[in-house]
C-alpha cells in the first residue's frame, strides 16, 4: 500500500486518537448488590462517562485491544467492624475473558482497616486505591470486587469509582 | 477542506501531541496556608513542571479541553491527633468552573489515620492517594483540599503532590 | 525539509505512537533480596510486560526521553511488627541517573501500618500506592525501595507491582 494507504491510516489514527478509549464510572446506591457479584456502577450521570469502552453488569468491556491503565478506588468505613479487629478487606480488579472460565486477578489490595477502631462503637474511615497497566483484548471485561462489601461506603460517586484509559 | 486541510490538521495534531498537557506540582513549606483555602504548590523547582497547563493560587488551570487523569497524594502524619481516634481526614480534588459558583467534588477520600498511633508511640504516618479521569473545559480549574490540613506533612516535594495529564 | 520530510516524521510518529513506552512489572518470590538493594521484579510471566522500556536489576530503564507516569503498589502485612507498633514503612520510587552518584527521591510514602494490629499476635494487612508524572531522560532508571522490606507480602504478582507509561 502506497502513500495513499498510509495517508488513510494516518487519517484513521487521527480520528481514533480523538477517541482514545477512556472511562470513569462512579459508585451509586445500586453498586452494592450483596449477591456475591462484582460492584455495579453509574455510567452516565454526573462525572461518569464511557468513551470507546462499553459497560455490562458491572464490567468495563473492551472494544479496542491494547494496553490500558485501569484503576479503582473504594471508600471504606463503618462503626466498628462485622468481624471485629480481624476484619480484612480485599479490593481487586479482575479480568473476564471468553478464553478462560474463571476471572483472573489483575490488581489486588488487602487491608485491615478495623484496627483503627478500638471499640464496637468507633467510627472509622479508610480508602483503597488500585491502578496499573494491563493488556486487554477486544471483548474482554474488567470488574471490581470488594470482600467484605458491607464495609464499602457510597455517597455521591466521588469516593468509590472505577475507570480506565488506553496508554 | 481537502487533503491540504487534513494535512494541516495532522501537522497541528503532531505539534499538539508533542505537548500533550501534563503537570506535576509538589508540596512546599508554603503549601499549608491555614486560611481554609486549597493547598498551594511548587510549580517549577525540583520535580515540579507545567506543560500545556497553567497554575493560579493552588489551582491547575486547563487551557485545552479534554479528558484528564488527575491525581494527588498527601503525606499525613503527626504526634497524636487533635481529635484523637475520632480525627477524620478528607482529601479531595475539586473543580472550579466559571459556570457554577461553588466547587464541585471530583475525587474524595476519607481516612481515620489516628488509630495508627498507639499507647506506646504517639507518632504515626499515613498516606492518601487519589486518581481518576475527569472531563475539563478550557478555563476550568482543579484544586486539592485537605481537612484537617494540620495533619499534612510536607518535606521535600516527594511525599505530597498534585498532577494531571490528558488521556 | 519540505512536505516529504514532514510526511516521514508523521509516519515515524505513527510508528512510535504504536509503541508508546509502557511497562508493568510484578512481584515475585525473588523480589525481596534482603541485601539493602531495590526490589526485583518479574518482567515477562503472567501480567508482566515491557514495551519500549528495558529492565536491569530491579530498574525500569528509559530508552526514550519524556514525561512518564510511574507507579508502584506494595502489599504490606504481618503478624505483629518487627519493631513493635512504632514501625514505619517507607515506600518510594527513586531515579538513578548517570549524571549524579546518588539515587534521587521521586515519589515517597510513609505509613505506620502496625497500629492496625492491637497486639503482638495480631495479623494485619495494609497497602501503599504511589503514582505521579516525572521527566526521565534516555538511560535513566527508576527503582522501587521499601524499608522495612520484611513487611512486604508477595504472592502472585497482583498485590505488589511497578509500572510506567509515557504521557
Amino acid at each position: 500500500d502506497g502513500p495513499a494507504g498510509s495517508w488513510e491510516q494516518l487519517i484513521q489514527e487521527r480520528r481514533s486518537h480523538e477517541v482514545n478509549p477512556a472511562a470513569h464510572l462512579t459508585g451509586a446506591n445500586s453498586s452494592l448488590t450483596g449477591s456475591g457479584g462484582p460492584l455495579l456502577w453509574e455510567t452516565q450521570l454526573g462525572l461518569a462517562f464511557l468513551r470507546g469502552l462499553s459497560y455490562h453488569d458491572g464490567a468495563l468491556v473492551v472494544t479496542k485491544a491494547g494496553y490500558y491503565y485501569i484503576y479503582s478506588k473504594v471508600q471504606l468505613g463503618g462503626v466498628g467492624c462485622p468481624l471485629g479487629l480481624a476484619s480484612t478487606i480485599t479490593h481487586g480488579l479482575y479480568k473476564r475473558t471468553p478464553r478462560y472460565p474463571e476471572e483472573l486477578e489483575l490488581l489486588v489490595s488487602q487491608q485491615s482497616p478495623c484496627g483503627r477502631a478500638t471499640s464496637s462503637s468507633r467510627v472509622w474511615w479508610d480508602s483503597s486505591f488500585l491502578g496499573g497497566v494491563v493488556h486487554l483484548e477486544a471483548g474482554e471485561e474488567v470488574v471490581v470486587r470488594v470482600l467484605d462489601e458491607r464495609l464499602v461506603r457510597l455517597r455521591d460517586g466521588t469516593r468509590s469509582y472505577f475507570g480506565a484509559f488506553m496508554v | 477542506d481537502g487533503p491540504a486541510g487534513s494535512w494541516e490538521q495532522l501537522i497541528q495534531e503532531r505539534r499538539s501531541h508533542e505537548v500533550n498537557p501534563a503537570a506535576h506540582l509538589t508540596g512546599a513549606n508554603s503549601s499549608l496556608t491555614g486560611s481554609g483555602g486549597p493547598l498551594l504548590w511548587e510549580t517549577q523547582l525540583g520535580l515540579a513542571f507545567l506543560r500545556g497547563l497553567s497554575y493560579h493560587d493552588g489551582a491547575l488551570v486547563v487551557t485545552k479541553a479534554g479528558y484528564y487523569y488527575i491525581y494527588s497524594k498527601v503525606q499525613l502524619g503527626g504526634v497524636g491527633c487533635p481529635l484523637g481516634l475520632a480525627s477524620t481526614i478528607t482529601h479531595g480534588l475539586y473543580k472550579r468552573t466559571p459556570r457554577y459558583p461553588e466547587e464541585l467534588e471530583l475525587l474524595v477520600s476519607q481516612q481515620s489515620p489516628c488509630g495508627r498511633a498507639t499507647s506506646s508511640s504517639r507518632v504515626w504516618w499515613d498516606s492518601s492517594f487519589l486518581g481518576g479521569v475527569v472531563h475539563l473545559e478550557a478555563g476550568e480549574e482543579v484544586v486539592v483540599r485537605v481537612l484537617d490540613e494540620r495533619l499534612v506533612r510536607l518535606r521535600d516535594g516527594t511525599r505530597s503532590y498534585f498532577g494531571a495529564f490528558m488521556v | 525539509d519540505g512536505p516529504a520530510g514532514s510526511w516521514e516524521q508523521l509516519i515515524q510518529e505513527r510508528r512510535s505512537h504504536e509503541v508508546n513506552p509502557a511497562a508493568h512489572l510484578t512481584g515475585a518470590n525473588s523480589s525481596l533480596t534482603g541485601s539493602g538493594g531495590p526490589l526485583l521484579w518479574e518482567t515477562q510471566l503472567g501480567l508482566a510486560f515491557l514495551r519500549g522500556l528495558s529492565y536491569h536489576d530491579g530498574a525500569l530503564v528509559v530508552t526514550k526521553a519524556g514525561y512518564y507516569y510511574i507507579y508502584s503498589k506494595v502489599q504490606l502485612g504481618g503478624v505483629g511488627c518487627p519493631l513493635g507498633l512504632a514501625s514505619t514503612i517507607t515506600h518510594g520510587l527513586y531515579k538513578r541517573t548517570p549524571r549524579y552518584p546518588e539515587e534521587l527521591e521521586l515519589l515517597v510514602s510513609q505509613q505506620s501500618p502496625c497500629g492496625r494490629a492491637t497486639s503482638s499476635s495480631r495479623v494485619w494487612w495494609d497497602s501503599s500506592f504511589l503514582g505521579g508524572v516525572v521527566h526521565l531522560e534516555a538511560g535513566e532508571e527508576v527503582v522501587v525501595r521499601v524499608l522495612d522490606e520484611r513487611l512486604v507480602r508477595l504472592r502472585d504478582g497482583t498485590r505488589s507491582y511497578f509500572g510506567a507509561f509515557m504521557v
Partner: antibody, heavy 119, light 111 residues
Framework: QVQLVQSGAEVKKPGASVKVSCKAS????????MNWVRKAPGQGLEWMGR????????NYNQKFMGRATFTVDRSTSTVYMELSSLRSEDTAVYYC????????????WGQGTLVTVSS | DIVMTQSPDSLAVSLGERATINCKAS??????????MNWYQQKPGQPPKLLIY???NLESGVPDRFSGSGSGTDFTLTISSLQAEDVAVYYC?????????FGQGTKVEIK
C-alpha cells in the same frame, strides 16, 4: 475570651474519692483536647492524662491508670477528673489545661483546685 | 518514660541581663523535623503559662525577650533581658510520647 473555671478546694480522707470539674467557655469546646496536670507541694508538674471532648476518648498516664477517670459533659462544656483511693501524696493543686491548636502543648489553664488528703 | 532534666535548678540574674535555662531529654523528642518541646512559666499561686511551643515558637502575647532553641535532646530557653515580672519557675515539657513529662523546674530570681 477563653476561660477555664475549676471547682473549689476539697479536703478528703485517705481512701476517698474526689471529683474536680473544669468548665470551658470562649471557644468551640469539642475542638480542643483537655489535659489534667497536678502539682504537689515542693514537687514539679505531673501530667495525668487527657480527654477528647468530641468523643470522650481518654489517655491516662500509667501511674494513674485505674484510679483516675476523666469524663465530659458536652451540654455544659465541662470536663471532670475523678481520683479514687486517695492517699496523702495525692495532696496537690490539680489543673485542667487546654490543648493548643497544634494540640501538643497547653495554651490555657484553669486556676487550679487544691485537693488536700488528710486523716 | 522520657526523663527531662533541667539545669540549673535555680538562677539569679541581674535586671536587664540574659538568663539561660537548659533542658535535656533522655531521648530525642523530634518528629519529621519538628521538636515536641514546650516551655512554661509558673508564678506562685498561679497556673502555668505557655511561653514557647515546638522548641522555638513564641506563644501569642508572650514578650519577644523570651526565645527557645534546640533539637533532638538538648534545648534552651533564653530571656534576653530579665525583667522583674519574669521571676518565676520555668518548666520544659515533652509531648512526643505518653506520658507527657516535665523537667523538675528552674527557679529564676533577681540578683
Amino acid at each position: 475570651q477563653v476561660q477555664l473555671v475549676q471547682s473549689g478546694a476539697e479536703v478528703k480522707k485517705p481512701g476517698a474519692s474526689v471529683k474536680v470539674s473544669c468548665k470551658a467557655s470562649g471557644y468551640t469546646f469539642i475542638d480542643h483536647i483537655m489535659n489534667w496536670v497536678r502539682k504537689a507541694p515542693g514537687q514539679g508538674l505531673e501530667w495525668m492524662g487527657r480527654i477528647y471532648p468530641v468523643s470522650g476518648e481518654t489517655n491516662y498516664n500509667q501511674k494513674f491508670m485505674g484510679r483516675a477517670t476523666f469524663t465530659v459533659d458536652r451540654s455544659t462544656s465541662t470536663v471532670y477528673m475523678e481520683l479514687s483511693s486517695l492517699r496523702s501524696e495525692d495532696t496537690a493543686v490539680y489543673y485542667c489545661g487546654r490543648g493548643s491548636y497544634y494540640w501538643n502543648a497547653m495554651d490555657y489553664w484553669g486556676q487550679g483546685t487544691l485537693v488536700t488528703v488528710s486523716s | 518514660d522520657i526523663v527531662m532534666t533541667q539545669s540549673p535548678d535555680s538562677l539569679a540574674v541581674s535586671l536587664g541581663e540574659r538568663a539561660t535555662i537548659n533542658c535535656k531529654a533522655s531521648q530525642s523528642v523530634d518528629f519529621d523535623g519538628e521538636s515536641y518541646m514546650n516551655w512554661y512559666q509558673q508564678k506562685p499561686g498561679q497556673p502555668p503559662k505557655l511561653l514557647i511551643y515546638s522548641a522555638s515558637n513564641l506563644e501569642s502575647g508572650v514578650p519577644d525577650r523570651f526565645s527557645g532553641s534546640g533539637s533532638g535532646t538538648d534545648f534552651t530557653l533564653t530571656i534576653s533581658s530579665l525583667q522583674a515580672e519574669d521571676v518565676a519557675v520555668y518548666y520544659c515539657q515533652q509531648s512526643i510520647e505518653d506520658p507527657w513529662t516535665f523537667g523538675q523546674g528552674t527557679k529564676v530570681e533577681i540578683k
